[in-house]
Interface confidence: low
């Protein structure tokens, strides 16, 4: 676990001619905000792929109103860092996508309008705990200057942040042997010392000197795989009936969750679901009130009405959990229809629709044929949101306005000669061939191998293609 941090230093017109003077449209003032998206690995990912490492949205910047005579400035930016918490190990290689969004503040129907102003993508290798990396990127006519780093939260050891403690405000790192902080404590938490030699990976303890095994492991130090050890004559606790090693207790055996918490097994471990008023790895921490600030991510804390419910967190959109500690990946529900791109802006979801679709969820298929007449007898066809004309013979192009030469593709086979005709084309077949495209050979006895010529047409006569 840890935090990826992005500091935007400046965003403004790039060097050179044609640089925009203002990010705002002619409709009036606007302000900027930024969205950062992190994806693991260095591979070129589709823009629509999820931000698997996390995403964050900045606050809105100050309102910008263009001064007609003033030189184009660096634009006023939101204050502070963009921080993307990551829960698991830092992957080291990642894709960084930074989007600059414009919020127009003019008289918009239905409130402010958002539009994507610039998007930069960088594929990078970065070790956690390292210094700030600086970068300058151009996106179209805009230039973005920024710095970024990944830092482990507290026990900043190693480049992947594999064991950590996360407080809300704290010095550089936890000391040795500390497990992650209880979610609401501003500090690190020290678990008990286990029996000497108790397996780091497969054992745990709740009391000093204890060594309890996770599911699938056994032995006094939890070092023996339960599935392979039975009846192999290994020393250890055994069953009187079989002489086999007894599998170690499952993670939830004896219910490690205190204070009425319910235990559920997870791969190789367990998870406690705590009743309100308790938290911590094993629901061991109690007595929390709103004064302790238990609601994360802007959640509103309300004092509970009964003693069993010391507080209740009302979570803002996009967060859930008894402490609003879990981010809801609302885009994972794929709310955007018809291939629209989902953007979780924090305060709201937005769908960026593909051409031909509209609506909050891209649910409306725009009638591209409305007001789009196809010329020269062509008919308009809707398909996938794209306007297309099916043109009459002899015409082509997007709107059937271009005259097409039907003979250009040399449609007459076996040396037949092509003639353009008002309703299509006519093939004059070479001797020995017949058919609308001169595709059928004529037998020497005058009988064709395939369908006979229509009445009134002899082999060799021009065949008009209807």
């Amino acid at each position: 676990a840890g935090v990826f941090e992005l500091q935007i230093h400046s965003f403004g017109p790039g060097p050179g001619p044609g640089a925009p003077r203002s990010p705002c449209s002619a409709r009036g003032p606007c302000r900027l905000f930024f969205r950062v998206c992190l994806k693991p690995g260095l591979s070129e990912e589709a823009a629509e792929s999820p931000c698997a490492l996390g995403a964050a949205l900045s606050a809105r910047g100050p309102v910008y109103t263009e001064q007609p005579e003033a030189p184009a400035p660096d634009l006023p930016l939101p204050n502070g860092l963009l921080q993307v918490p990551f829960r698991d190990a830092w992957p080291g290689t990642f894709s960084l996508i930074i989007e600059t969004w414009r919020e127009e503040l003019g008289d918009q129907i239905g409130g402010p309008a958002w539009s994507l102003l610039a998007r930069v993508t960088r594929r990078r290798r970065l070790a956690a705990g390292g210094p700030w990396a600086r970068d300058i990127q151009r996106a179209g006519a805009w230039e973005l200057r920024f710095s970024y780093r990944a830092r482990c939260e507290l026990l900043a050891v190693g480049t992947a942040c594999t064991r950590l403690c996360r407080p809300r405000s704290a010095p550089s790192r936890c000391g040795p042997g500390l497990r992650p902080c209880a979610p609401l404590e501003d500090e690190c938490e020290a678990p008990p010392v286990c029996r000497a030699g108790c397996s780091l990976e497969h054992g745990f303890c709740e009391q000093p000197g204890e060594c309890r095994c996770l599911e699938g492991w056994t032995g006094p130090l939890c070092t023996v795989p339960a599935s392979t050890s039975s009846c192999l004559g290994l020393r250890g606790p055994s069953s009187a009936t079989t002489g086999c090693l007894v599998p170690g207790p499952g993670p939830c055996d004896g219910n490690p969750c205190a204070n009425g918490g319910s235990c559920s097994e997870t791969p190789g471990s367990f998870e406690c679901t705590c009743p309100r008023g308790f938290y911590g790895l094993r629901c061991e921490v109690s007595g929390v009130t709103c004064a302790d600030g238990p609601c994360f991510n802007g959640g509103l804390c309300v004092g509970g009405a009964d003693p069993d419910s010391a507080y209740i967190c009302h979570c803002p959109p996009g967060f859930q959990g008894s402490n609003c500690e879990k981010r809801v990946d609302r885009c994972s529900l794929q709310p955007c229809r018809n291939g629209g791109l989902c953007l979780d802006l924090g305060h709201a979801l937005r769908c960026r629709c593909r051409a031909g679709f509209a609506g909050p969820r891209c649910e409306h298929n725009l009638d591209d044929c409305a007001g789009r007449a196809c010329a020269n007898g062509g008919t308009c066809v809707e398909g996938g949101g794209a306007h297309r004309c099916s043109c009459a013979l002899g015409f082509g192009g997007r709107d059937c306005r271009e005259r097409a030469d039907p003979c250009a593709a040399r449609p007459c086979a076996h040396g037949g000669r092509c003639y353009a005709h008002f309703s299509g084309l006519v093939c004059a077949c070479a001797p020995g061939y017949m058919g609308s495209r001169c595709e059928f050979p004529v037998h020497p006895d005058g009988v064709s191998a395939l369908p006979a010529a229509p009445p009134g047409l002899r082999p060799g006569d021009p065949q008009r293609y209807l």
């Epitope: 938490e189 008990p192 010392v193």
Partner: antibody, heavy 119, light 107 residues
């Protein structure tokens, strides 16, 4: 039975080097924090460094950073402290101590080895 | 670095006395505080971990408590073998730091 035995101490001149060893028995150092703590004559305890061998995690006190290096050989179940650029103020009894993965304290200590830095 | 300010630096007491030693952390160190006993020429011994948990084999007359950033080691009834120097230690943040020690002497 858990046991820690330090060795390698002695008299060394300022600017010199010394390598301390801490041989562990009765437990596996790979899943424990191995600490070095020192105590100057007549003074209190001062933490020097730790290593967590499984992941190669290390941490140092500011006073020794860049001069001392902690390491471990899990095949020999031994932790080491390489001390370079030694100063008079490094003179102390150096203790090796164990801290469990699940635990912040130091539950087993060696008997200590004396390092004297003097010309 | 976190300072652990231990007081008193020395005290004189008699067998059977109740003895209290305190340690104040310069900032929050959670409960990651341990107490050690050291006798002359010997290595320290762990008494208390996690601020208030009694380590295996340590007599129950030793106890630890925490109040905010103040940590207390109490010996409820001092015994002859308890005359020694006591150290607190925090392991919440690196670098690990010790208090300067409290020497408990016979009155």
């Amino acid at each position: 039975e858990v046991q820690l035995v330090e060795s390698g101490g002695g008299l060394v001149q300022p600017g010199g080097s010394l390598r301390l060893s801490c041989a562990a028995s009765g437990f596996n150092i790979s899943s424990s924090y191995m600490h070095w703590v020192r105590q100057a004559p007549g003074k209190g305890l001062e933490w020097v460094a730790y290593i967590y061998p499984s992941y190669g995690y290390t941490s140092y006190a500011d006073s020794v950073k860049g001069r001392f290096t902690i390491s471990a050989d899990t095949s020999k179940n031994t932790a080491y402290l390489q001390m370079n650029s030694l100063r008079a103020e490094d003179t102390a009894v150096y203790y090796c101590a164990r801290g469990g993965y699940y635990y912040h304290g130091m539950d087993y200590w060696g008997q200590g080895t004396l390092v004297t830095v003097s010309s | 670095d976190i300072q652990m300010t231990q007081s008193p630096s020395s005290l004189s007491a008699s067998v059977g006395d109740r003895v209290t030693i305190t340690c104040r952390a310069s900032q929050s160190v959670s409960s990651a505080v341990a107490w050690y006993q050291q006798k002359p020429g010997k290595a320290p011994k762990l008494l208390i971990y996690s601020a208030s948990s009694l380590y295996s084999g340590v007599p129950s007359r030793f106890s630890g408590s925490r109040s905010g950033t103040d940590f207390t080691l109490t010996i409820s009834s001092l015994q002859p073998e308890d005359f020694a120097t006591y150290y607190c230690q925090q392991a919440s943040w690196s670098p690990i730091t010790f208090g300067q020690g409290t020497k408990v002497e016979i009155k």
